[in-house]
């Protein structure tokens, strides 16, 4: 039930990567508009994206206040010309989202290899510590700041001349690996949160190879 020509939102879906978090839903509006509300389990509702014809709402600013909280959102539907109108029960038509806990559920973005440096038979590979939109004391925190030792990286590396791969793990953003002198290697990294049960791994970083501009070589 609801106001004439107004339909409830459906397929409410959280899309979140490195804490940038957007709520999406359907349908594309026809003669109606939407308003989103978000709250923690114990908090008050806060309205966002007022009377919008979009079918998404950026809720990043709300969820970064405490990424370990569990959030619930709801999408209200109103007739386009009469946003004061309510459903038959005396309140606007709305639909609830699934619960969302950013710390446990945000997707890990594709990492980037910042640099690699060879010294003799050792190579130091550094992963860029991506900045998030999570703030503490007016500074944006990095992925490592937020996740600490919960975040590890897996490195895949192989000789440019062969298909045999090796792997290494780190709980920092650096790898120090042994290589054969005079051989060029290629590298790819993946972010992992082993304690999670879902959204545990990122996609692989772009492959970087020695002999290209990112690296440095020292005897």
């Amino acid at each position: 039930s609801g106001t004439t020509n107004t339909v409830a939102a459906y397929n409410l879906t959280w899309k979140s990567t490195n804490f940038k978090t957007i709520l999406e839903w359907e349908p594309k509006p026809v003669n109606q508009v939407y308003t989103v509300q978000i709250s923690t389990k114990s908090g008050d509702w806060k309205s966002k994206c007022f009377y919008t014809t979009d079918t998404e709402c950026d809720l990043t600013d709300e969820i970064v206040k405490d990424v370990k909280q569990t959030y619930l959102a709801r999408v209200f539907s109103y007739p386009a010309g009469n946003v004061e109108s309510t459903g038959s029960a005396g309140e606007p038509l709305y639909e609830n989202s699934p619960e969302f806990t950013p710390y446990l559920e945000t997707n890990l973005g594709q990492p980037t290899i910042q640099s690699f440096e060879q010294v003799g038979t050792k190579v130091n590979v550094t992963v860029e510590d991506e900045r998030t939109l999570v703030r503490r004391n007016n500074t944006f925190l990095s992925l490592r700041d937020v996740f600490g030792k919960d975040l590890i990286y897996t490195l895949y590396y192989w000789k440019s001349s062969s298909s045999g791969k090796k792997t290494a793990k780190t709980n920092t953003n650096e790898f120090l690996i042994d290589v054969d002198k005079g051989e060029n290697y290629c590298f790819s990294v993946q972010a992992v949160i082993p304690s999670r049960t879902v959204n545990r791994k990122s996609t692989d970083s772009p492959v970087e190879c020695m002999g290209q501009e990112k690296g440095e070589f020292r005897e």
């Epitope: 590890i152 897996t154 895949y156 791969k165 090796k166 792997t167 290494a168 793990k169 780190t170 709980n171 920092t172 690996i177 993946q190 992992v192 949160i193 082993p194 304690s195 049960t197 879902v198 545990r200 791994k201 996609t203 692989d204």
Partner: antibody
Framework: QVQLLESGAVLARPGTSVKISCKAS????????MHWVKQRPGQGLEWIGG????????MYDPKFQGRVTITADTSTSTVFMELSSLRSEDTAVYYC??????????WGQGTLVTVSS | DIQMTQSPSSLSASVGDRVTITCKAS??????LSWYQQKPEKAPKSLIY???SLADGVPSRFSGSGSGTDYTLTISSLQPEDFATYYC?????????FGGGTKVEIK
């Protein structure tokens, strides 16, 4: 619940190949790494290699490189290990195991491979 | 390749004893060290992950410690069901390597 169910015991001739399987349930193999471990009778554990089903990367112990191939079929949640040019010292129990990133937290029941003429 | 030296290779102990098993890596493995228990004709079972964390369902008498190259598995009060073989595993880099195992037998 998480389970790894391995294929049954195999008797193989020297010089031939075997392909054993490990069917996972209770989790998505693309979210984890999958490994194979060898244990000869009365001996310790030996890592053969592993695979990341999400991106198809496979890594092998140099001792097995060239003789072993580890693959994963994400549509059936099954991991395979093929071992070729079999010799008597390949007679062993082969275990598949799930790697969370912190540990091999779940193991299959083991597949006995006997190499004999 | 990283070598894992596990000691002792065997030990005899009584129920109630405190048992300590050590693993030494040939280089820093950054806590990517796990411990396993194996009973005859059974698959290994995960006990400790990330050097110090107790795996689900494992009794609290088991504990892990260490960092860098030196790691320890401790059983604070040995129980009858703890008689088994224990292995450490480094998975910080490939090839992954197991310790040689420690067989815990009844005195």
């Amino acid at each position: 619940q998480v389970q790894l169910l391995e294929s049954g015991a195999v008797l193989a001739r020297p010089g031939t190949s075997v392909k054993i399987s490990c069917k996972a349930s209770g989790f998505n193999i693309k979210d984890y790494y999958m490994h194979w471990v060898k244990q000869r009778p009365g001996q310790g554990l030996e890592w053969i290699g592993g695979n990341d089903p999400a991106n198809k990367h496979s890594m092998y112990d140099p001792k097995f490189q060239g003789r072993v191939t580890i693959t994963a079929d994400t549509s059936t949640s099954t991991v395979f290990m093929e071992l070729s040019s079999l010799r008597s010292e390949d007679t062993a129990v082969y275990y598949c195991a799930r790697d969370s990133g912190y540990a091999m937290d779940y193991w299959g029941q083991g597949t006995l491979v006997t190499v004999s003429s | 390749d990283i070598q894992m030296t596990q000691s002792p290779s065997s030990l005899s102990a009584s129920v109630g004893d405190r048992v300590t098993i050590t693993c030494k890596a040939s280089q820093d493995i950054k806590s990517f060290l796990s411990w396993y228990q194996q009973k005859p004709e059974k698959a290994p079972k995960s006990l400790i992950y990330y050097a110090t964390s107790l795996a689900d369902g494992v009794p609290s008498r088991f504990s892990g410690s260490g960092s860098g190259t030196d790691y320890t598995l401790t059983i604070s009060s040995l129980q009858p069901e703890d008689f088994a073989t224990y292995y450490c595993l480094q998975h910080g880099e490939s090839p992954y390597t197991f310790g040689g195992g420690t067989k815990v037998e009844i005195k």
